[in-house]
């Protein structure tokens, strides 16, 4: 469900929301760290709709979400598991 | 205008089955999903069931999926409850809602219900 | 099944006064709260969602607030409109479970 991608393409997010989504209408979740032309870092939320929504990294549900799924992770794998994007 | 009308409500034996429909209009039906929420007399709320807008997902309440099937017509732009071996306890109004799954992601439009009266 | 236990269950308040329903949820649901108002023999209608966010055309003196297992619902300025039943509800997952109600009544 998380995905870490480090791009050099400038920032993909103009809009942010802070609004919490159920975790059954997620498809996945892409982080994009800071750095590489864009100066903040920047989270992805792929909808089961097909639609995109950009969350604000700052945002409570988003933070306690990835808190769950990081103890979740850990628990299973070794370590983390990070996808990397060619750009 | 968002429009749910609920119909297929009525007196009933138990034991009996019921066919509920909700017709929605000014809204693109095919990309929401759609719940069924249900109130006994005097009580809460109480959520039956949803359906995703391919019918692909589907969840109940774990003590009504036995005897409750929620389906769908996109084509139609209606929503159906079938609910079978009714009981006195299923006695309530049920309301059809939509499930913003965009921008709100619970229920944000509701109908204004149909009664369902179970008894001998 | 996720518990919602709302209280009070009735509440009688005078007009201006500021208006306090609380929701203890039986486990964490993130913000994944929502506050309905209903009239009777009418439908609910959504006031708030994801625990503190007003829906379109609520006015302001209804807000939200909390996270995880506590949630609070306000009204700061009671008006004679307001008298109705609130319900709340959480949407992290299915089962989707409401709260018990509370009644508001004027003095």
């Known amino acids: 469900v998380l995905e870490v991608y480090y791009t050099s393409l400038r920032c993909r997010c103009v809009q942010e929301s802070s609004v919490f989504i159920p975790r059954r209408f997620i498809d996945r979740i892409q982080i994009l760290p800071r750095g590489n032309g864009c100066p903040r870092k920047e989270i992805i939320v792929w909808k089961k709709n097909k639609s995109i929504v950009c969350v604000d990294p700052q945002a409570e549900w988003i933070q306690r979400m990835m808190e769950v799924l990081r103890k979740r992770s850990s628990s299973t794998l070794p370590v983390p598991v990070f996808k990397r994007k060619i750009p | 205008e968002v429009q749910l009308v609920e119909s297929g409500g009525g007196l009933v034996q138990p034991g009996g089955s019921l066919r509920l429909s909700c017709a929605a209009s000014g809204i693109d039906f095919s990309r929401y999903w759609m719940s069924w929420v249900r109130q006994a007399p005097g009580k809460g709320l109480e959520w039956v069931a949803e359906i995703n807008p391919e019918s692909s997902t589907i969840n109940y309440a774990p003590s009504l999926k036995d005897r409750f099937t929620i389906s769908r017509d996109n084509a139609k732009n209606s929503l159906y409850l079938q609910m079978n071996s009714l009981r006195a306890e299923d006695t309530a109004v049920y309301y059809c809602?939509?499930?913003?799954?965009?921008?709100?992601?619970?229920?944000?439009?509701w109908g204004q219900g149909t009664t369902v009266t179970v008894s001998s | 099944d996720i518990q919602m236990t709302q209280s009070p269950s009735s509440l009688s308040a005078s007009v201006g006064d500021r208006v306090t329903i609380t929701c203890k949820v039986s486990?964490?649901?993130?913000?994944?709260v929502a506050w309905y108002q209903q009239k009777p023999g009418k439908a609910p209608k959504l006031l708030i969602y994801s625990a503190s966010y007003r829906y379109t055309g609520v006015p302001s003196r209804f807000s939200g607030s909390g996270s995880g297992t506590d949630f609070t619902f306000t009204i700061s300025s009671l008006q004679p409109e307001d008298i109705a039943t609130y319900y709340c509800q959480q949407y992290y997952s299915t089962p989707l479970t409401f709260g018990g109600g509370t009644k508001l009544e004027i003095k």
């Open positions: 486990q964490d649901v993130n913000t994944g």
């Open positions: 809602a939509r499930q913003d799954d965009y921008e709100h992601y619970t229920m944000d439009y």
